[in-house]
């Protein structure tokens, strides 16, 4: 029998009063040893379920269960995942803003909408917030002496055309 | 000395009220869960009220609840039973006792630290 | 309410006897059962908890057993300071006491 709660180990409660090293009772645990009582292990249920079962040195860990994802440390709340044109954010799931777009399911983020532009396209159909633009073919820039060679299908024979 | 001392009790008329206290020494009572267990003369023990270590949570006997009220005072590791329209069937001896249980919890209380108790006698 | 029962409710033995005290409980409380001692005009002292378990400073000659509903205290030599009253608790479901058993010295 020891008379210091100091030597406690992980996964035991002592008392001042009786400074003896006692297992945490069922459905608790202790992750620094001489502390008065054992803490109340957390229960994964509802939108929970155990990612980590509790022990008597670790509480147990929650994750949320399919179509549903973590909010808060310690995945305190479960939330709906996220809408195709919604990503998640801290305050939970918010639309994409004006220019930018989310196709996926449950994950991912806002992501800008493609610049068509830049590859010299036209847009042949705008963005939402869950679908990209789609770009048209590149547009054509014709310049003085650009020569564009035509061959029909199915024949060798080519028509050259000038372009002044 | 770690100890626990009740006092507050006496003689009171039914329908009256009384309030007891129980002062812990030589340790954290604010540590522990507490509960008060009572005694009348030549007869068993009975678990009255229950606080936990940081007072948000109590339990009643079904025979006291409405009339008994538990609470503390942590800073100055202090217990309360406030006893109001007494009945002569609440004459005992009164214990203020540690929940040994170790588990924070508001369901299995066993008692490991006890005062020396404090008499109530309920009468007219 | 979890019912107790304690038996013998008086018991006589002699000094260096092997005594025991019985506990029964209505329905199971699995290992949630403790054991008190009341000597005269004093407060409880717990002996056992989780129904096997020797509560520190006790004696050794004191030791629980049992589980579910039906349990046991037994003193391997009793000594004339174990002249007291004694009563189980079970915790399992809320708290409930025995009505005690009342050990004497022949």
């Known amino acids: 029998v020891q008379n210091s709660c100091d030597n406690c180990q992980p996964g035991t409660f002592c008392r001042k009063y009786n400074p003896v090293c006692k297992s945490c009772p069922p459905s608790t645990f202790s992750s620094i040893g001489g502390q008065p009582n054992c803490n109340i292990c957390r229960v994964c249920a509802g939108y929970f379920r155990f990612k980590k079962f509790c022990s008597s040195t670790h509480n147990a860990e929650c994750e949320c269960i399919e179509g549903f994802h973590c909010l808060g440390p310690q995945c305190t709340r479960c939330e709906k995942d996220c809408r195709p044109g919604q990503e998640l954010t801290k305050q939970g799931c918010k639309t994409c803003s004006l220019g930018t777009f989310n196709d996926q399911n449950g994950t991912g983020v806002c992501r800008p909408w493609t610049n068509c532009s830049l590859d010299g396209r036209s847009v042949l159909k705008t963005g939402t917030t869950e679908k990209d633009v789609v770009c048209g073919p590149p547009v054509v820039s014709f310049s003085p002496s650009t020569t564009i060679s035509v061959t029909p299908e199915g024949g060798p024979g080519g028509h050259s055309l000038q372009v002044l | 000395e770690m100890q626990l001392v009740e006092s507050g009790g006496g003689l009171v008329q039914p329908g009256r009220s009384m309030k007891l206290s129980c002062a812990g020494s030589?340790?954290?009572?604010?540590?522990?869960?507490v509960a008060w267990v009572r005694q009348a003369p030549k007869k068993g023990l009975e678990w009255v009220a229950y606080?936990?270590?940081?007072?948000?949570?109590?339990y009643y006997r079904e025979s006291v609840k409405g009339r008994f009220t538990i609470s503390r005072d942590n800073a100055k590791s202090t217990l309360y039973l406030q006893m109001d329209s007494l009945r002569s069937e609440d004459t005992a001896t009164y214990y203020c006792?540690?929940?040994?249980?170790?588990?924070?919890?508001?369901?299995?209380?066993?008692?490991?630290?006890w005062g020396p108790g404090t008499m109530v006698t309920v009468s007219s | 309410d979890i019912q107790m029962t304690q038996s013998p409710s008086l018991l006589s033995a002699s000094v260096g006897d092997r005594v025991t005290l019985n506990c029964r409980t209505s329905?199971?409380?699995?290992?949630?059962l403790a054991w008190y001692q009341q000597q005269l005009g004093e407060a409880p002292k717990l002996l056992i908890y989780?129904?096997?378990s020797l509560q520190a400073g006790i004696p050794s000659r004191f030791s629980g057993s049992g589980s579910g509903t039906d349990f046991t205290l037994t003193i391997s030599s009793l000594q004339p300071e174990d002249v007291a009253t004694y009563f189980c608790?079970?915790?399992?479901?809320?708290?409930?006491f025995g009505a005690g058993t009342n050990l004497e010295l022949k």
């Open positions: 989780n129904a096997n």
């Open positions: 030589g340790f954290t009572l604010s540590d522990y869960g």
């Open positions: 329905q199971n409380v699995y290992k949630n």
């Open positions: 608790q079970q915790y399992y479901s809320g708290n409930t």
């Open positions: 006792t540690i929940d040994g249980y170790g588990g924070y919890s508001g369901s299995h209380w066993y008692f490991d630290f």
């Open positions: 606080i936990s270590y940081a007072g948000g949570t109590t």
